[in-house]
């Protein structure tokens, strides 16, 4: 899978869409996970409704939401109040049994907001020690919807 880059802006919302073949993935739940390291596991952030027919309902985990258009074949992830630690590699997955197919690999980049000065007139510049690896998967990622889906193995 090629990696699709999505640039989000700090403090704003980001939407990531993952397109997929609706027939091939019929009846499958989807998930959004964060890749831990280059060859590490993909830690699930959020998955669609336990009942596939209700996949259109938006589910939240912290500031990350997921919704699935199962007819149109588009999985949408919303990352709210994007922060520098949200930057990193993610996957949209399609779940079947204990397996997960990757629908799209997504690299989220978090950019400075040139216009949001928080009324202070100065941008906040994170320290060098605040690396992306320190981020918690639960943290929100905000941004416009992108086309893509995230299949993750169902939660036990």
């Amino acid at each position: 899978h090629n990696t699709t880059v999505f640039q989000g802006v700090a403090g704003q919302s980001l939407q990531v869409s993952c397109p997929y073949d609706s027939m091939k993935h019929w009846g499958r739940r989807k998930a959004w996970c964060r890749q831990l390291g280059e060859k590490g596991p993909c830690q699930r952030v959020v998955s669609t409704h336990n009942l596939w027919l209700l996949s259109f309902l938006r589910r939240w985990n912290g500031s990350t939401a997921i919704t699935d258009d199962t007819l149109g074949g588009t999985l949408t992830i919303t990352l709210r109040n994007l922060q520098p630690h949200d930057a990193g590699l993610y996957q949209c997955q399609s779940l079947h049994g204990s397996e997960a197919d990757t629908l799209r690999k997504v690299l989220v980049e978090v950019l400075a907001d040139p216009l949001d000065h928080r009324d202070a007139g100065d941008l906040w510049f994170p320290g060098e020690s605040e690396s992306f690896e320190d981020a918690h998967v639960e943290h929100s990622i905000s941004r416009s919807l992108l086309e893509g889906e995230i299949p993750f193995p169902p939660t036990s």
Epitope: Q7, L14, Q15, A87, A112, P114, D122, F125
Partner: antibody, heavy 122, light 112 residues
Framework: EVKFEESGGGLVQPGGSMKLSCTAS????????MDWVRQSPEKGLEWVAE??????????YYAESVKGRFTISRDDSKSSVSLQMNSLRTEDTGIYYC?????????????WGQGTLVTVSA | NIMLTQSPSSLAVSAGEKVTLSCKSS????????????LAWYQQKPGQSPKLLIS???TRESGVPDRFTGSGSGTDFTLTINSVQAEDLAVYYC????????FGAGTKLELK
């Protein structure tokens, strides 16, 4: 192909009002942050205003020089953005370009309209 | 606001020459969080709107000839045009988008 088409420019007297419009095509307009940038021989290129997308609450931002006088708005159903300019001053004269800082995926002024000329003069 | 100073203000060149345009920022436009320089270069031909050439100081836009190269970091940036062509005669602007949105005054590239 991404396109921006501006309209509404012309001649107006100081203190007067004018409304510029821009229609966009070739991309998902509702995802984009829409901007107006103006250009004059005196001030060069100058960012004027921005309106963000729905997911970011259609937040608006303005350059200090136009704050309180200009209002940016958008209609996603028509893929259009407008700039209402009130209390116009001679220094507001210039070519006004419609552009987009962020298209929902990338941050940069990648595409610009051809511009519409606004002349504020007695 | 961050101010951008471009030099020279104008430059007369011959076809085939290598040209170097400078842009200096009053503050760093490097954002340590994502290791990017928030600086872009635009080309504007007479009667036309600006065209994006380079973003993130060195990323060439799709369709831009590889004779255009952006470099630099922090406060000092350069746009290099290797072997200038007649169609490159234009005004070149740098633009920062880290803190507010500001543009340089431009460098006019003319034929010698």
């Amino acid at each position: 192909e991404v396109k921006f088409e501006e309209s509404g420019g012309g001649l107006v007297q100081p203190g007067g009002s004018m409304k510029l419009s821009c229609t966009a095509s070739g991309f998902t307009f509702s995802d984009a942050w829409m901007d107006w940038v103006r250009q004059s021989p005196e001030k060069g290129l100058e960012w004027v205003a921005e309106i963000r997308n729905k997911i970011n609450n259609h937040a608006t931002y303005y350059a200090e020089s136009v704050k309180g006088r200009f209002t940016i708005s958008r209609d996603d159903s028509k893929s259009s953005v407008s700039l209402q300019m009130n209390s116009l001053r001679t220094e507001d004269t210039g070519i006004y370009y419609c552009t987009s800082l962020y298209d929902g995926s990338y941050l940069r002024f990648a595409y610009w309209g051809q511009g519409t000329l606004v002349t504020v003069s007695a | 606001n961050i101010m951008l100073t471009q030099s020279p203000s104008s430059l007369a060149v011959s076809a085939g020459e290598k040209v170097t345009l400078s842009c200096k920022s009053s503050q760093s436009v490097f954002y340590s969080s994502n290791q990017k320089n928030y600086l872009a270069w635009y080309q504007q031909k007479p009667g036309q709107s600006p065209k994006l050439l380079i973003s993130w100081a060195s990323t060439r836009e799709s369709g831009v000839p590889d004779r255009f190269t952006g470099s630099g970091s922090g406060t000092d940036f350069t746009l290099t045009i290797n072997s200038v062509q007649a169609e490159d005669l234009a005004v070149y602007y740098c633009h920062q988008y880290l803190s507010s949105l500001t543009f340089g005054a431009g460098t006019k590239l003319e034929l010698k």
